[in-house]
Structure formats: C-alpha cells, structure tokens
C-alpha cells in the first residue's frame, strides 16, 4: 500500500493494514458464501508455510469514521466502507473437505455516497 | 466486492474488477521491490492449479477519470488512484529461484485529495 501522505496527499478514507495469520483468522467466507476453516499450514514442496493474509480495512479510530474527508456535504451523505477482495487459501469446508478456495478478505477502505434529498 | 449501487449508493471512484491468470500477468513486484516471474501453475496434492488473481483497479473509462465524485471542489483537488495489496504467489526471481513470495496486486480504487492553494 503506497502512502498518499508521503506525496502531500490525503485519503478520502483512513485505513489500517495488518498481517493476519490463519491461526488468528480461523474462518472465512468463500466465493459461494459458505463459511470455511482457514488452515494454519500450507504444504509446499517438501515443507510447510504459514498462511498469512495482508488485510486493509477502514480505521475505526480515524478522522473519517463519521464520514469521508473532502466531500461536498451540501449535496452528499458519505460513509467510509471496508471492501473485500478474493485471495486463494487452503481451507476446509463443513464436510471436512480440504482444498484451495478463494476466500474474501478485507483489502480496502473506500467512500460511498448517497444523494441528499431536498428538505 | 459488494456493489454499492445495489444499495442506492455511488462510489467516489469507479473501479473495475477482473480475474487475471499468471499467464496474463507474467511478472509482478515482490515485497522487497524486486521483479519476479509469476508461474502459471502451482503444484498441489493431486496435480496442478492455475494461478489466478482477483484484481481491482480504477476504471479508465469511468466518470471519475477526471477526479473523484462528490468532492468539495472549492477546497480540494482529487484523483482516483489504484491501490495495491499483497498476495502470496509462486514465483521465480532473477536468479531462477522458485518460491512462494508476497507480490503486489491491484486491489482497489480510492480517492486522494490535495488542498487547493489560495489563488
């Protein structure tokens, strides 16, 4: 995640990023909407890797928890919202079937708008 | 990616998402800033999987290519910018060493602001 502040810029929504291990994640939602268990270890050629995920979400302590920064408030209501993407992970479904599935993880914080209705 | 439009909302920045294969991606940048080759297939317990990535970027054809939607233009300049995250991928570095590395992929389109200076 390149930091806009380094270029003298501000984000419309403040976010936080962190590394999360499968040990802490435990479960996730797959592409079909089912809950799956995220396995801690991935077998690789002759060994194991820890499953790690880089997650980004809206900063609940940030300035923008009340609404997005820089919005024209006369015409718009705004809200910072965490959005998700898909990454492949080694998982186990409810029937104990282990396999590589795409799971949803938090990857961004974006601003959504709704038009202000006339009073 | 949940669709804000379904809830009568608009995004400050328009984005497009697509599935990209390693065959199309070919190379990527790893966490240390080095360019690596993304391998097309990943060996799994019963064969091989194609490496796929779910990528989201700013829509170059969208309304927001000239600036973000809903911004207070009296005080702010704005720009929609594609941001990146990290996902693990099977890659080969410049020394032909194959391994699982975190690579950067496009995951979102966010709005960045700069303050308008007094004329």
């Amino acid at each position: 995640h390149s930091d806009p502040a380094r270029r003298g810029e501000l984000s419309v929504c403040d976010s936080i990023s962190e590394w999360v291990t499968a040990a802490d994640k435990k479960t996730a939602v797959d592409m079909s909407g089912g809950t799956v268990t995220v396995l801690e270890k991935v077998p690789v050629s002759k060994g194991q890797l820890k499953q790690y995920f880089y997650e980004t979400k809206c900063n609940p302590m940030g300035y923008t928890k009340e609404g997005c920064r820089g919005i024209d408030k006369r015409h718009w209501n705004s809200q910072c919202r965490t959005t998700q993407s898909y990454v492949r992970a080694l998982t186990m479904d409810s029937k104990k079937r282990i396999g590589w599935r795409f799971i949803r993880i938090d990857t961004s914080c974006v601003c959504t708008l709704t038009i202000k209705r006339g009073r | 990616h949940s669709d804000p439009a379904r809830r009568g909302e608009l995004s400050v920045c328009d984005s497009i998402s697509e599935w990209v294969t390693a065959a199309d991606k070919k190379t990527a940048v790893d966490m240390s800033g080095g360019t690596v080759t993304v391998l097309e297939k990943v060996p799994v317990s019963k064969g091989q999987l194609k490496q796929y990535f779910y990528e989201t970027k700013c829509n170059p054809m969208g309304y927001t290519k000239e600036g973000c939607r809903g911004i207070d233009k009296r005080h702010w300049n704005s720009q929609c910018r594609t941001t990146q995250s990290y996902v693990r991928a099977l890659t080969m570095d410049s020394k032909k060493r194959i391994g699982w590395r975190f690579i950067r992929i496009d995951t979102s389109c966010v709005c960045t602001l700069t303050i308008k200076r007094g004329r």
Epitope: E18, W19, T21, D24, E40, K46, G47, Q48, K50 | -
Partner: antibody, heavy 119, light 108 residues
Framework: DVQLVESGGGVVRPGESLRLSCAAS????????MNWVRQAPGEGLEWVSA????????YYADSVKGRFTISRDNSKNTLYLQINSLRAEDTAVYYC????????????WGLGTLVTVSS | EIVLTQSPATLTVSPGERATLSCRAS??????LAWYQQKPGQAPRLLIY???TRATGIPARFSGSGSGTEFTLTISSLQSEDFAVYYC??????????FGGGTKVEIK
C-alpha cells in the same frame, strides 16, 4: 528502531514458577507472531514457544508442553511466558524473538533474561 | 523432528581468510533455512534466510548456499568482528523449529 526488552528472570527453586515479560517497541506488534528461544549456559539455541499475532495460535516444544504458557497483550505491546514447575534443565537465558513476515525465522531478538533453577 | 548438524564445531581462521561453515539436515528442508551470528553476551543476529538471501544490513562478504539437506555459510574475507558462533535454523517443518549445535569461528 525495533526493540525487545525481556524481564522477569531470576533465581528460583525447582518446582517454583516465574513469569517472563518482553516489552516490544518500534513496530506494529500485533502484525508479528512472537517466539521465545532459550540458551542454556555454554549451549546452543533451543526454540521454546510461539504465539500468533492476535493470540489465536500457540505452539510449544515438547520439553515444555504443559508447564509453559505463552500469551500476549497487544494493547501493551507485551509478550509473556508463564513458567511453572521449573526444573534444573530450564536454567537458561530466555530470548524473546520477533518472527519475520518472510518465514518462520527471527529478524529481531531481545538481549535475554536469565532464569536460574537451583536448590 | 528435523535434526541439524553443523560442522566443524570449531573453525580456526586468520583474518582476511575465507571461512566455510556447513549445516546438514536429517531430511530435506527445501530452502527454508536461516543463519545467525552470536557474539559472547549478545543476542543472535539474523544473517541469512531462505538459504541464500542476506538480511537487511548484512555485509556482502556473508553468503549462503544450498538446498534440501546440505547448506553452506561462507564468509569471504573474515573481519575481526566476524569471530563468533554461527547457528543454522530450519523452518520447513514446524513445530518445532530446530537449530544446529553451532560452529565457533576463532582467530588463528
């Protein structure tokens, strides 16, 4: 700068307990799995225990299983090791070590705290 | 558990000479091996990970090679500050993580 400072060591009798602490600074503590590694006087390094970033996964060497408990308080940026039923063979310098994101090895170590078990 | 055997136990070398340290694994650890340096009274310091990648701030005279079961740490031209004990560590199969017994590099 990353800093890890252990405390809580001392001279104890066999069968007694101790709680070691490791105060971390200079990095986002919750993003890293943390480990304890010990070194008996004049001997090599022995891995003791590990804990995932948010505490969801804990791991122990067979030699300490059931007697040692690893924990962390991310709000205080502190790692702990509760040591019960101490034995003479537990005499060692106990190091707190930060696990890298790149793999399960240790990119930063504390200076250690000495635990001496003697009757 | 995977056993790592380091040899020699002690290596006596003159400053400016090349030092070659060996680490052998009881089974393949792929390239999942790290090397550390430890000086008396100090904590270990990461030198190499992934069998051959130098950690941040480590001088180019340190290099790692090997994969599978045979690994080598080479110090191309020993400086006075390089006299220390060196440990290898595997992270291919865990828990437990395991360390080698160490090689002490002494001044001739």
């Amino acid at each position: 700068d990353v800093q890890l400072v252990e405390s809580g060591g001392g001279v104890v009798r066999p069968g007694e307990s101790l709680r070691l602490s490791c105060a971390a600074s200079g990095f986002t503590f919750k993003n890293h799995d943390m480990n304890w590694v010990r070194q008996a006087p004049g001997e090599g390094l022995e891995w003791v225990s590990a804990i995932s970033g948010r505490g969801g996964g804990t791991y122990y060497a067979d030699s300490v299983k059931g007697r040692f408990t690893i924990s962390r308080d991310n709000s205080k940026n502190t790692l702990y090791l509760q040591i019960n039923s101490l034995r003479a063979e537990d005499t060692a310098v106990y190091y707190c070590a930060r696990e890298s994101i790149w793999g399960i090895f240790f990119d930063y170590w504390g200076l250690g705290t000495l635990v001496t078990v003697s009757s | 558990e995977i056993v790592l055997t380091q040899s020699p136990a002690t290596l006596t070398v003159s400053p400016g000479e090349r030092a070659t340290l060996s680490c052998r694994a009881s089974q393949s650890v792929s390239s999942n091996l790290a090397w550390y340096q430890q000086k008396p009274g100090q904590a270990p310091r990461l030198l190499i990970y992934g069998a051959s990648t130098r950690a941040t701030g480590i001088p180019a005279r340190f290099s790692g090679s090997g994969s599978g079961t045979e690994f080598t740490l080479t110090i191309s031209s020993l400086q006075s500050e390089d006299f220390a004990v060196y440990y290898c560590q595997q992270y291919n199969n865990w828990p437990p993580l395991t360390f080698g017994g160490g090689t002490k590099v002494e001044i001739k």
